[in-house]
Interface confidence: medium
């Protein structure tokens, strides 16, 4: 079968070559070809060219539509929900659950701890942390939430920080911290949230969340 296909391909190629040669001869006004033949061949050739050009136009239109749809500059957004963790780590844990957002694979939640972006650009990054603490049960130090940036080949830096003193309410008083700002992120950059005491963080619906949006 393969051999027959090859022969067929070669025959087609030969026919194409003869066709092109004939056009060439028509153009040079060779006498061995009748005018009728030449006209017929020329119109056939023009038809092919027209088809090719029309196809090109269609592709162009499709591509410009794709661009309009935003494929060249896709929306990049994420909103993740807090997740209680048995680990004593100061890094807050997040999950894609409830009413979360993960626009596409240009932003990912890595190990449940950090949002990582694949494209460079300006991003609005935010976090809301709700915590319940009591002055007597807590240390003297305030509750601090930090939004941190980790770039490839570079160690982390603090982007934003907020501190709240502990409540006198018993057993504990609920307070919320909101952090948000616009930052330039490099491809592969990650952002995460650190708190001084993760055991005090409230994980009820809507209390603690984290996200970003590419501007």
């Amino acid at each position: 079968h393969r051999r027959l296909d090859k022969i067929e391909d070669e025959r087609n190629l030969h026919e194409d070559f003869v066709f092109m040669k004939t056009i060439q001869r028509c153009n040079t006004g060779e006498r061995s070809l009748s005018l009728l033949n030449c006209e017929e061949i020329k119109s056939q050739f023009e038809g092919f060219v027209k088809d090719i050009m029309l196809n090109k136009e269609e592709t162009k239109k499709e591509n410009s539509f794709e661009m309009q749809k935003g494929d060249q500059n896709p929306q990049i957004a994420a909103h993740v929900i807090s997740e209680a963790s048995s680990k004593t780590t100061s890094v807050l844990q997040w999950a894609e659950k409830g009413y979360y957002t993960m626009s596409n694979n240009l932003v990912t939640l890595e190990n449940g701890k950090q949002l990582t972006v694949k494209r460079q650009g300006l991003y609005y990054i935010y976090a809301q942390v709700t915590f319940c603490s009591n002055r007597e049960a807590s240390s003297q130090a305030p509750f601090i939430a930090s939004l941190c940036l980790k770039s490839p080949g570079r160690f982390e830096r603090i982007l934003l920080r907020a501190a709240n003193t502990h409540s006198s309410a018993k057993p504990c008083g609920q307070q919320s911290i909101h952090l948000g700002g616009v930052f330039e992120l490099q491809p592969g950059a990650s952002v995460f949230v650190n708190v001084t005491d993760p055991s005090q963080v409230s994980h009820g619906t809507g209390f603690t969340s984290f996200g970003l949006l590419k501007l």
Partner: nanobody, 123 residues
Framework: EVQLLESGGGLVQPGGSLRLSCAAS????????MMWVRQAPGKGLEWVSA????????YYADSVKGRFTISRDNSKNTLYLQMNSLRAEDTAVYYC????????????????WGQGTLVTVSS
């Protein structure tokens, strides 16, 4: 302040074993992919092994595959490299660093390096 402190190097006979440690501080160790690189006398940096932030995924250079084992203890902020069946060509200063998928491997690419630990394999 970020610090990476390598230890465990020394003189060992061919076929012997060593365990290197890298104590990390000043950054959130559990979020970082880490790696070991080495620099043999008069040579450039060579990537040896890497490990994912949670320790579940490991990578090795062909030259050390089956002989070296990378591991980490996030609760202790420490990275390890168990080196078995050591050869003369493993002689080098070993450094730990954050692993990222850069195309080059030069000290300039990273903010922090430890002082390294010298491993000498000789009879």
């Amino acid at each position: 302040e970020v610090q990476l402190l390598e230890s465990g190097g020394g003189l060992v006979q061919p076929g012997g074993s060593l365990r290197l440690s890298c104590a990390a501080s000043g950054f959130t160790f559990e979020l970082y992919r880490m790696m070991w690189v080495r620099q043999a006398p008069g040579k450039g940096l060579e990537w040896v092994s890497a490990i994912s932030s949670d320790g579940d995924t490991t990578y090795y250079a062909d030259s050390v595959k089956g002989r070296f084992t990378i591991s980490r203890d996030n609760s202790k902020n420490t990275l390890y490299l168990q080196m078995n069946s050591l050869r003369a060509e493993d002689t080098a200063v070993y450094y730990c660093a954050e692993h990222w998928l850069g195309t080059t491997l030069s000290l300039r690419d990273f903010d922090y390096w430890g002082q390294g630990t010298l491993v000498t394999v000789s009879s």
